[in-house]
Interface confidence: medium
């Protein structure tokens, strides 16, 4: 077979080939940030000639052109400056309102390197309508100027811009516009992963019993869907495997889908996952009708077995057939469960379509979407039972109009995205899902997104104020119990003056709780070994506090998972017969285990817990501490096997006021407490009044820093004795 010529360089850019120079290979151009390739791609035809999609001439010279952002076509009740035909990357446009109108949105917007404006649409509104003025996004033209209940507005884009979002919106009874804000974008524009992850995550989290993190205080804004943990979600993952997707890209599609599956199962809701790959024909690798679709390991394994070569005989892009196979699956399930049953009607459905191009065979995918909407009886009341996410990857042949048509349109949400490449897709799926907004006592959930506050990242973290002395830290292990260190309470047992400060979404200062009961390990006695020349001894340095009231679970207050419990077993997604030993083997499974604790200022700091032979050499340093242990002969007299050891290499050292706080690790996007901060050889906050100020030990420090943490796996009998009614413990 003839190969295509190799004179296809792009000045100032690079290119990749999906299948070398052979017929069927897709050549994809890319340019540095702020530039876009024209044309974006070429296809090697069987004749041995390059074909440029949409081009009239067969081979125009490829060039990198500067990205520009669209100009406002009209801006009501105000003025904008400067007035240009389009704006260069880095260029600003500013908005001001006439008297009597208030500016909503961003007063200044900057053109970003992807051809999209930053910020939000600026609107000059006088608040006169039933619905707020919906505004006119940059590059758009709106018809319709009445904002009363039932009024409609329509949008179109100027010149060659592409509309995403709703071309028509209606003012609803609740004062909210139907659909989603329309945006006019350059055909070559794409979304940055850092924009897509929260947008996608926000929408997806709604479905998973979460509320919109950007939601305004007005209750009616946005939707608040609760899938209780008894609810059910069908997730359908559709992976494009057509010719233009390279094998490497398909691998990243699979990896991204695996991440998604991993995250979705961490919600502990009932979920079934379908996996469908498609090119000219769809191939169902896992159906929601199969019991295995509820088992994460089975779903992941079916994803791993997805083979790029499954579709080598038919390499078109038949998105219609892929969506239709979802429709057929739904139809079978409906017949199985019964159309009128709650079991069927209460299932929520989410479809994620990962594609790199427009469908080029099999008819309009919109038809399949209409069938799906029909079978699920999607109307205004049941709008929340279906979400379709259309994600285009690669900028090349992705059809914005088609993606937009397929994606759901819901107020304040986006369902259609185009990403620059599969790497960006991977980033999105890594960061999109956030279980931290569930309202029940699901353990070990922290918000991992970049813009989360410290307390949202570690919502179990509490501050304990015993009388007026130095504070200690602790961790919520249920909605009413806090685990901390015994040495925080050396001054007798009158806890009436103590307070526990717990995170609260309504206050940056948190919420104070009184203590109903303090349970301090009877084995703790700091002077127990004084006569052996050990001036301080921290064996059994563990305590439990029962709060006077239950803590309301929120983004800022939630228990951490305690290993050796059913709750942790669920979070680790281990089989039912698992034991405490299994948890220890899974969590403390290396010579050096990366872990964290929380600093005085609330930030999460890193340590490495030393195990096995490394534990011995970590603890050995204590023999150099002549002040606390003047005539120590055996280090194990001080560092018993109750302690975990850290403080080597680049580890942070806890400060004095951080005692009692959780030492925790992350597994499968969930957090598990394996220890609690007890004592150490160096205080990095000594002499500093600033909570943000801690310094590593100077190199002249002898002995070098070491930190010791009570190992919760060694405190099981005591924990079970006092928490048997609170948590469900596994056999040892």
């Amino acid at each position: 077979a003839p190969s295509c010529p190799q004179n296809v360089n792009i000045s100032g850019g690079t290119f990749t080939l999906s299948h070398g120079w052979a017929p069927g290979s897709l050549l994809t151009y890319s340019c540095p940030q702020g530039l876009y390739p024209s044309p974006a791609s070429r296809l090697c035809k069987s004749s041995g000639q390059w074909q440029t999609p949409g081009a009239t001439r067969s081979l125009s010279k490829a060039v990198c052109k500067p990205v520009r952002c669209p100009a406002p076509v009209s801006f009501e009740n105000g003025i904008y400056t400067p007035r240009l035909g389009s704006y260069p990357v880095g260029g600003n446009v500013s908005f001001e309102c006439e008297d009597g109108f208030i500016l909503r949105g961003s007063p200044v917007r900057q053109c970003r390197p992807n051809g999209m404006w930053d910020g939000e649409t600026a609107v000059c509104d006088n608040g006169a309508g039933h619905c707020p003025n919906p505004g006119i996004s940059l590059g758009a033209v709106r018809t319709g100027f009445r904002f009363g209940h039932g009024d409609k507005v329509r949008y179109r884009c100027s010149s060659n811009l592409v509309l995403t979002g709703s071309s028509e919106r209606e003012c609803q009874g609740n004062g909210v516009w139907s659909g989603t804000e329309p945006i006019c974008r350059q055909p070559y524009s794409y979304d940055f992963p850092e924009d897509v992850a929260p947008a996608l995550g926000t929408s997806f989290s709604h479905m998973l019993g979460a509320t919109n993190p950007t939601q305004k205080t007005k209750e009616s804004l946005g939707r608040k869907i609760q899938i209780q943990r008894s609810g059910h979600l069908n997730l359908y993952l559709l992976l494009d495997c057509s010719q233009s997707v390279s094998e490497n890209d398909f691998l990243i599609f699979k990896e991204s889908a695996s991440l998604m599956v991993d995250r979705i199962f961490s919600f502990e809701i009932n979920v079934s996952v379908a996996i469908i790959t498609f090119a000219s024909e769809p191939k169902v690798l896992m159906s929601v009708l199969n019991d295995n679709s509820r088992d994460m390991t089975e779903v992941i394994s079916s994803l791993e077995n997805a083979n790029y070569k499954d579709h080598e005989n038919g390499t078109g892009t038949n998105t219609y057939a892929a969506l239709n196979s979802v429709y057929l699956m739904m139809n079978n399930q409906m017949r199985l469960l019964g159309m009128e049953t709650m079991a069927w009607q209460e299932i929520r459905h989410a479809i994620i379509l990962l594609t790199d191009g427009k469908s080029n065979m099999g008819g309009s995918p919109k038809t399949a979407v209409d069938h799906i909407r029909e079978i699920l009886n999607i109307n205004q009341k049941r709008n929340d039972y279906l979400d379709i996410y259309a994600i285009g990857v690669g900028k090349l042949d992705v059809d914005w109009r088609e993606l937009n048509e397929l994606g759901s349109k819901k107020d304040g949400e986006r369902h259609a995205f185009i990403l620059q490449d599969t790497k960006a897709l991977h980033q999105v799926f890594e960061h999109m899902l956030d279980v931290s907004k569930l309202t029940d006592t699901i353990c070990g959930v922290g918000n991992m997104s970049a813009n989360a506050s410290d307390q949202e990242r570690t919502p179990w973290h509490v501050t304990i104020k015993p009388k007026s002395q130095e504070t200690c830290r602790g961790a919520l292990i249920s909605d009413q119990w806090v685990l901390t260190a015994a040495h925080c309470f050396r001054d007798g047992n009158d806890h009436s003056l103590w307070r526990v400060n717990v995170g609260d979404p309504k206050s940056q200062w948190g919420k104070e709780f009184l203590i109903e009961k303090a349970v301090i390990s009877p084995g703790f006695d700091v002077f127990a070994k004084k006569n052996q020349g050990i001036l301080e001894f921290y064996g059994d340095d563990i305590a439990l506090l029962k709060l006077a009231q239950k803590v309301k679970m929120s983004t800022h207050a939630r228990p951490i998972c305690l290993p050796c419990t059913m709750e942790a077993n669920l979070a680790l997604r281990r089989p039912q017969g698992s034991t405490c030993r299994d948890h220890e083997n899974e969590l403390l499974n290396k010579q050096s285990v990366p872990a964290h604790f929380v600093a005085l200022n609330g930030s999460k700091l890193n340590i490495n817990l030393k195990m096995g032979v490394e534990w011995t050499s970590c603890a050995e340093v204590v023999s150099q501490e002549k002040t606390m242990f003047p005539n120590l002969t055996d280090v194990r007299e001080v560092v018993t096997d109750q302690f975990l050891c850290s403080g080597t290499q680049e580890d942070e050292s806890p400060c004095k006021g951080e005692s009692g706080g959780a030492v925790f690790l992350e597994r499968r996007f969930r957090f598990f407490q394996v220890g609690l901060v007890s004592w150490g050889l160096y205080n990095p906050c000594l002499g500093s009044a600033d909570k943000n100020s801690r310094k590593r030990a100077p190199r002249s420090k002898v002995p070098p820093p070491r930190d010791f943490h009570i190992n919760l796996f060694r405190m099981q009998p005591w924990l079970r004795q006092h928490l048997g009614d609170v948590l469900n413990f596994l056999p040892l």
Epitope: L605, Q624, E652, P684, K695, R696, R699, S700
Partner: antibody, heavy 118, light 111 residues
Framework: EVQLVQSGAEVKKPGASVKVSCKAS????????MDWVRQATGQGLEWIGD????????GYNQKFKGRATMTVNKSISTAYMELSSLRSEDTAVYYC???????????WGQGTLVTVSS | DNVLTQSPDSLAVSLGERATISCRAS??????????MHWYQQKPGQPPKLLIY???NLKSGVPDRFSGSGSGTDFTLTISSLQAEDAATYYC?????????FGQGTKLEIK
């Protein structure tokens, strides 16, 4: 007040050794590392190494390892740096400097000029 | 080793004007929440003198016209209003890990 007083200038032949001393006062000698830095005429600063006076543990710049030896005499609060197999390019001012709690050189000796010449 | 590169090698600034010296590290000097980068001033025939420690902290006794900024690999020493006695050579130095290294120095002259 913290003071570091170094020994006087030295002239040495190539291949010989030189031992520079640095007497510390005004603080507890064993509490802070002592570093040695050199500076050839008209050139920049070059770190040789440091010593922890308490445990006499040392850290060396690889370039000087095997040729430089740092020691202390705790009883007289004095640090020493000996450089062997001298070459003409070792002609420089040698400084002792005391580290602070931030591992910065907060206090410096007045410098000792070592000239290597045949 | 972490190579520190100062720029410019020399500069001449008028009295009362602002002087800025940059220091770029080949590897990050940040650890434990601090940037282990320090700045020194050296006048002919004298040992260096510590001005700024941990990137931005002014050593006591140093005039507050001196300031330091930066994080990770890029750092700046600024003299807000140059005085005659500020003519000297300035060095950056890191203590992130061994071996400690210095920048090549920037000679500041009065114009």
């Amino acid at each position: 007040e913290v003071q570091l007083v170094q020994s006087g200038a030295e002239v040495k032949k190539p291949g010989a050794s030189v031992k520079v001393s640095c007497k510390a006062s005004g603080y507890t000698f064993t509490d802070y590392n002592m570093d040695w830095v050199r500076q050839a005429t008209g050139q920049g600063l070059e770190w040789i190494g440091d010593i922890n006076p308490n445990y006499e543990s040392t850290g060396y710049n690889q370039k000087f390892k095997g040729r430089a030896t740092m020691t202390v005499n705790k009883s007289i609060s004095t640090a020493y740096m000996e450089l062997s197999s001298l070459r003409s390019e070792d002609t420089a001012v040698y400084y002792c400097a005391r580290e602070d709690d931030h591992d910065a050189f907060a206090y410096w000796g007045q410098g000792t000029l070592v000239t290597v010449s045949s | 080793d972490n190579v520190l590169t100062q720029s410019p090698d020399s500069l001449a600034v008028s009295l009362g004007e602002r002087a800025t010296i940059s220091c770029r590290a080949s590897k990050s000097v940040r650890t434990s929440g601090y940037n282990y980068m320090h700045w020194y001033q050296q006048k002919p025939g004298q040992p260096p003198k510590l001005l700024i420690y941990l990137a931005s902290n002014l050593k006591s006794g140093v005039p507050d016209r001196f300031s330091g900024s930066g994080s990770g690999t890029d750092f700046t020493l600024t003299i807000s209003s140059l005085q005659a006695e500020d003519a000297a050579t300035y060095y950056c130095q890191h203590s992130r890990e061994l071996p400690y290294t210095f920048g090549q120095g920037t000679k500041l002259e009065i114009k």
